[in-house]
């Protein structure tokens, strides 16, 4: 049977009808509407937008739309006591101060409530001391400083350039190195693409532009005061000293005009190699401290931000399924922004809005999806994925029993070159099949499929003729669904050409210059890339909610498990002597992967042959597919990261944005040669191999014939 027959509706109401209803002009209109004022989490403006979206989703035809509120820890600058950094002379006089705000973009000079640049959740403090330049503040940058260059960051203020890794990891690394403060800045090497003008004349970062962002190390905890449980009316809250993931030293972000003033005076050691040099006309000396003439001058930070428990609001819309209402496909993206949110998040929220409108139009014509679709407008994503995590904590029992899939919908664009997809291997075939049916929006690919342009521009490094699909990491609202609950997840957006553009993210990320005009003038004037992303995200939701057999292919998991096992074994084999000494074997893991591969193959054969008209057998097979992702969850979680429970994937311990495979084994092996107790360290490697092998074998058995 087709999915149309399954829900007794006319063939007119199929995927094509849904996709044809999506309109670029509507996405443009919605983006404009969502970006005229700031929508910072915890503010009245963002509450009003939540109510507006609730009202519009109801008008679009959803069965119900509710607000779900939580009282979570947020962070704001002190309005009367601004944050800044100064250079002070030997008498303590401030001879240079960084700017207190970004110059507003044209047309926005009179907008109120633009939050000045700050690092959310920085503690208060006024540390002063010598500066050390630490490159990107990655793990390997501190190894270079401490081990090779013998530079001690203890008691120093470090200055790090944004990029490469999540800013929270930078701060954690600086803390561990003993720093007493962190200055984050955007270097033109990373945030100014050659040959492009600064905003408002182009999409590059001007010297006064600054990236805001949180600096937490939550490791999936959600609200720092209520880890594991929803921050509801009767919540028990930890004291601030026991809060999860808060930084212990002051942190503040600046633009490259201000960074120039700090870096141009740097003395001490020269940069170790060219990879430590940015594009400013400064020596990129590491320090510590300023050069000769300025050696008596110090840097002083003035940070007065406050952490406050504040109410946030998610909007949750429901479109009830006709056949399996107790199976949930979720489309979610955040609504809160740092300032106007021209790209992050409103380019995503506008797409979600148009997807809801299209589904609502079909529903008004008598159609329903087979499974229930939940739509979410999350709050406080920028403050640590708080809205999505609290909602998932509140609804975890329903989600772990009923959650089929989660599709994320943050920024629709970070460039206009090609598609970028990160997802569970279960969704590879869904994404491939869908993109083969969609038209490419790319110049030079008229009349060609999206799959074709995507594969040409972003080829898979392993399989010729296929596009690159990346691992899920974190830094967005899918985290709780995938890493904690084990719900199959995916995300898609349009991206830049990573070959030619070496800058991190997009230049105006989290700055005041991320406006509607940025998108309309420079990134997507016709909104054709937004429309394509709407088709991909919406198409995935449609198929997941409407196909009779879930569009998951477990054989693709088998392929990647073998690849990941090969990779982690090769990493371990960098230590052959120790492996022999401590009798380390990956045989159990390779054996489990082999079993998984064989069982997945047999399951796929049964999936082709079974009687789809038998609703019990259909439900049984679909449940095996739905619960496969869940089978990779270890209830005990990863070491010291209890909310990262997926054994195959976790955010990298060195970069929250990146995904790591077999993270338990990877972390046990990381820098193992420096461990003081090798026997204990290799024992942990062996334990992690055991956990991984057991989990893969257990997951395989969920695909075996049930009796």
């Amino acid at each position: 049977k087709s999915s149309n027959e399954a829900t007794n509706i006319t063939p007119k109401h199929n995927m094509k009808a849904f996709l044809d209803e999506l309109k670029a002009e509507n996405i443009k209109k919605f983006l404009y509407n969502f970006t005229q004022i700031p929508h910072l989490a915890g503010t009245e403006q963002n509450f009003q937008l939540a109510k507006q979206i609730q009202s519009q989703w109801k008008e679009f035809g959803l069965d119900s739309v509710e607000l779900a509120h939580y009282d979570v820890l947020l962070s704001y600058p002190n309005k009367t006591h601004p944050n800044y950094i100064s250079i002070i002379n030997e008498d303590g006089n401030e001879i240079f101060n960084t700017s207190l705000f970004e110059p507003p973009p044209p047309g926005y000079e009179n907008v109120s409530d633009i939050v000045p640049p700050f690092s959310a959740f920085s503690p208060q403090g006024m540390p002063e001391g010598d500066l050390v330049y630490v490159n990107y503040a990655r793990t390997e940058d501190f190894f270079k400083l401490e081990r090779d260059m013998k530079i001690n960051c203890s008691g120093k203020i470090v200055i790090a350039r944004y990029g490469k890794v999540f800013r929270g990891n930078k701060v954690k690394n600086a803390q561990l190195a003993g720093a007493k403060g962190v200055i984050l800045y955007s270097d033109p090497a990373d945030y100014f693409a050659p040959g492009v003008k600064s905003y408002p004349d182009g999409w590059n970062l001007p010297g006064g532009g600054v990236q805001r962002g949180n600096i937490l190390n939550l490791n999936g905890a959600g609200d720092p005061l209520t880890p594991g449980y929803p921050a509801n009316e009767y919540a028990y809250r930890r004291g601030i000293a026991e809060a999860v993931g808060l930084p212990s030293i002051p942190v503040h972000p600046i633009g490259y005009y201000d960074a120039q003033k700090l870096l141009e005076k740097m003395g001490g050691s020269a940069p170790p190699d060219s990879s430590w040099r940015g594009s400013l006309k400064v020596p990129y000396n590491v320090g510590p401290g300023f050069t000769g003439n300025f050696s008596t001058q110090k840097v002083k930070m003035h940070i007065h931000s406050t952490n406050e428990v504040t109410r946030i609001y998610n909007v949750i819309g429901t479109l009830r399924g006709a056949v399996e209402p107790d199976r949930y496909v979720i489309l979610g993206g955040h609504r809160d922004s740092w300032v106007f949110g021209g790209i992050d998040p409103q380019s995503g929220a506008a797409v979600v809005h148009e997807i809801v409108r299209s589904f609502g139009t079909l529903k008004k014509e008598g159609w329903r999806p087979r499974r229930t679709i939940l739509f979410a407008s999350w709050d406080a994503e920028e403050f640590g994925l708080l809205g999505s995590t609290e909602w998932a904590e509140e609804n975890s029992r329903l989600l772990q029993e009923r959650g089929v899939a989660y599709i994320n919908a943050d920024s629709s664009i970070e460039g206009n070159y090609t598609l970028r997809v990160d997802c569970t291997p279960l969704m590879y075939s869904l994404v491939h099949n869908l993109t083969k049916e969609l038209k490419s929006p790319d110049e030079g690919f008229e009349g060609k499929s999206l799959y074709e342009s995507w594969t040409k521009k972003s080829p898979s490094p392993e399989f010729s003729g296929m596009p690159r699909i990346s691992k899920l990491g974190s830094g967005n609202d899918f985290e709780v669904f995938f890493q904690r609950l084990g719900i199959a997840s995916g995300r898609a957006r349009y991206t830049k050409n990573w070959e030619t553009n070496k800058f991190s993210g997009y230049p105006l990320y989290h700055s005041v210059y991320e406006t509607y005009e940025l998108v309309e003038k420079f990134y997507d004037p016709m909104f054709k890339y937004h429309l394509t992303v709407a088709q991909v995200r919406g198409g995935m939701v449609f198929e997941l909610a409407n196909s009779i057999v879930l569009p998951f292919d477990c054989r693709d998991y088998a392929v990647v498990l073998r690849k990941y096992a090969d990779k982690i074994y090769s990493i371990s084999m960098k230590h052959p002597q120790e492996m022999k000494t401590y009798s380390v074997s990956f045989d159990s893991l390779f054996s489990a992967v082999k079993n998984f591969t064989e069982i997945a193959s047999k399951f796929s054969e049964r999936l082709q042959d079974f009687d789809k008209s038998n609703p019990i057998v259909l439900r049984m097979m679909n449940d095996q597919l739905m619960f496969l992702e869940r089978a990779f969850i270890d209830p005990l979680g990863l070491p010291d990261r209890p909310f990262y429970r997926h054994v195959i994937y976790a955010p990298s311990s060195h970069n929250k944005y990146a995904g790591e495979s077999f993270p338990g084994i990877y972390d046990a092996l990381f820098d193992i040669e420096s461990k003081v107790d090798p026997s204990k360290a290799w024992g942990e490697v062996k334990r992690q191999i055991y956990v991984a092998a057991f989990t893969v074998q257990a997951a395989a058995e969920t695909l075996s014939e049930v009796a």
């Epitope: 084999m573 230590h575 022999k580």
Partner: nanobody
């Protein structure tokens, strides 16, 4: 009794490719219970694993050297070979071919080793 014997030039110029072959007697490289690998030892350093071949063609490589190493096998001759490209003086070492149990670093048999010097 299993025996492994390395062969190849003892002197290689910088930036060139080092090529070595291992001939196995008394056992088959097709055996799927074992991996067939290359390891090296530089003066004053520990053993460094370069990579291994198994199942008559699948390979594992040291991530640090991955872009420079190719290991291939010839089951008809019961040989497997190593190619290490873009060599520098740091690649000067005694190179051994060895058998190890699948998915371990348990090298139960290895060749006597061949010294390869990288020098112009």
């Amino acid at each position: 009794q299993l025996q492994l014997q390395e062969s190849g030039p003892g002197l290689v110029k910088p930036s060139e490719t080092l090529s070595l072959t291992c001939t196995v007697s008394g056992g088959s490289i097709s055996s799927n219970s074992y991996y067939w690998g290359w390891i090296r030892q530089s003066p004053g350093k520990g053993l460094e694993w370069l990579g291994s071949i198994y199942d008559s063609g699948s390979t594992h490589y040291n991530p640090s050297l991955k872009s420079r190493v190719i290991i291939s096998g010839d089951t008809s001759k019961n040989q497997f070979s190593l190619k290490l490209s873009s060599v520098t003086a740091a690649d000067t070492a005694v190179y051994y071919c060895a058998r190890h149990k699948a998915a371990t670093a348990d090298f139960d048999y290895r060749g006597q080793g061949t010294l390869v010097t990288v020098s112009s």
